[in-house]
Interface confidence: low
Amino acid sequence: AGVFELQIHSFGPGPGPGAPRSPCSARLPCRLFFRVCLKPGLSEEAAESPCALGAALSARGPVYTEQPGAPAPDLPLPDGLLQVPFRDAWPGTFSFIIETWREELGDQIGGPAWSLLARVAGRRRLAAGGPWARDIQRAGAWELRFSYRARCEPPAVGTACTRLCRPRSAPSRCGPGLRPCAPLEDECEAPLVCRAGCSPEHGFCEQPGECRCLEGWTGPLCTVPVSTSSCLSPRGPSSATTGCLVPGPGPCDGNPCANGGSCSETPRSFECTCPRGFYGLRCEVSGVTCADGPCFNGGLCVGGADPDSAYICHCPPGFQGSNCEKRVDRCSLQPCRNGGLCLDLGHALRCRCRAGFAGPRCEHDLDDCAGRACANGGTCVEGGGAHRCSCALGFGGRDCRERADPCAARPCAHGGRCYAHFSGLVCACAPGYMGARCEF
């Protein structure tokens, strides 16, 4: 288990002529928000296909009104990270879609108007537990700058967050320098020994003897802060390539505030300032309403008469979770009976039945002989989802329509001569032999 985190640094007109001045008109104030959709593997990035790894919606950004004639400022962005929790292993390769939405705060009947300004998509390789990766994507005339990472939630560790390592309460049977690693009682894991002197706060290693720096730090032992003069953005995770500083370790490291909450240190611990729609010590409790558009994958949000009432996402077939963010493998329930092949079409479930079976779930065993006549006095025999004919003497083939030569198989032993007869065959035995097939 772990969390994919996305930090938007900037969104605005891209370089070059013809770029828009602002996503808002001077007539109507607006604000931006973002949606991220994650899919495992290097799959298609079609926006309509499910966000099988999860999806998240940012808070609304500050309201912005374009001032005619004034120079275009940086567009105000929503605070905090977009976080997509994942329950299973981190796949390592993933596809993403990031959508930038504009909310116009005009006098429209029935509430504000939303419109999709830009959609960027990409395919990436990313190990969990690594540093922030920085990216720039262009969509039409717009440019989006962002950073992302995947981190494991304790006790999960590793590049896929699949190993569970935690100290056991019982005395460790592991040797000196080794730490106990659950779930296998006797499995002991050697900790990675980084290059001698590698900063424990600002460096890390994935191979013994190396020292890789977290963003904002440089030098062979990651002890030198990078110059801050070229920072693209004062907010959020920083980049060694652009030279933004990362603060030293503290209670807000890793941002314990969920759902885009911002963390501030207190004398004893930390405090989360939650975005609209969330509350709780770590902003883990949702007070979102349908006005926030919380349902993904075509899920339908239902809120009652009270504007502040909780919402319910009614998920379309194939999705589950409180926000319809999880794909259901409905075929894992083996709904098709009698060996039918299950096909999950997304909008519906189909069973492809074996011969001899029918029905939505292949539950009906057909009478294989119904409507199937065996010719020339043959008898239909049902079995195994198919039919066959037991033919009368002198006939053969699937439906007993072919005349059979009873002597073709040379049924008379010991040199006996075979004669076809209307009732079957007759063997004329060689001297010294007898029996219907000259077998004696």
Epitope: G110, G111, F296, G298, G303, H314, P317
Partner: nanobody, 127 residues
Framework: QVHLVESGGGSVQAGGSLRLSCAAS?????MGWFRQAPQKEREWVAT???????????YYVDSVKGRFAISQDNAKNTVYLQMNSLKPEDTAVYVC????????????????????WGQGTQVTVSS
């Protein structure tokens, strides 16, 4: 295109009951009722999920909770509004509305959420 036909309106004494019906000609995600009394704003009354995703989830405005019940007959593409303990203030033209467009955001009390509307049926409650 969805065509909605309402029936069941009429006059009744306070405390009485009426049952309204609304038949839809096509598939819908939600069907509901709004009402409009003379010189008043249109008011949302109740909505029910009609697509098989929704399992008949029903929602009501506070003023009718416990008195009105919305139900559905999927086979007939019809929803019913059973109105009990009627009060004079329930007098209005009751209009059936349906949601057919798929979206990720619906606010059921908002008329703008609904794509299709019926002609309306008059309900009069006298004291």
């Amino acid at each position: 295109q969805v065509h909605l036909v309402e029936s069941g309106g009429g006059s009744v004494q306070a405390g009485g009951s009426l049952r309204l019906s609304c038949a839809a000609s096509g598939y819908t995600y939600f069907m509901g009722w709004f009402r409009q009394a003379p010189q008043k704003e249109r008011e949302w009354v109740a909505t029910i999920g009609t697509g098989d995703i929704f399992n008949g989830a029903a929602y009501y405005v506070d003023s009718v909770k416990g008195r009105f019940a919305i139900s559905q007959d999927n086979a007939k593409n019809t929803v019913y509004l059973q109105m009990n303990s009627l009060k004079p203030e329930d007098t209005a033209v009751y209009v059936c509305a349906a949601v057919q467009s798929k979206s990720s955001n619906y606010v059921l009390r908002d008329a703008s959420t609904y794509n299709y509307w019926g002609q309306g049926t008059q309900v009069t409650v006298s004291s």
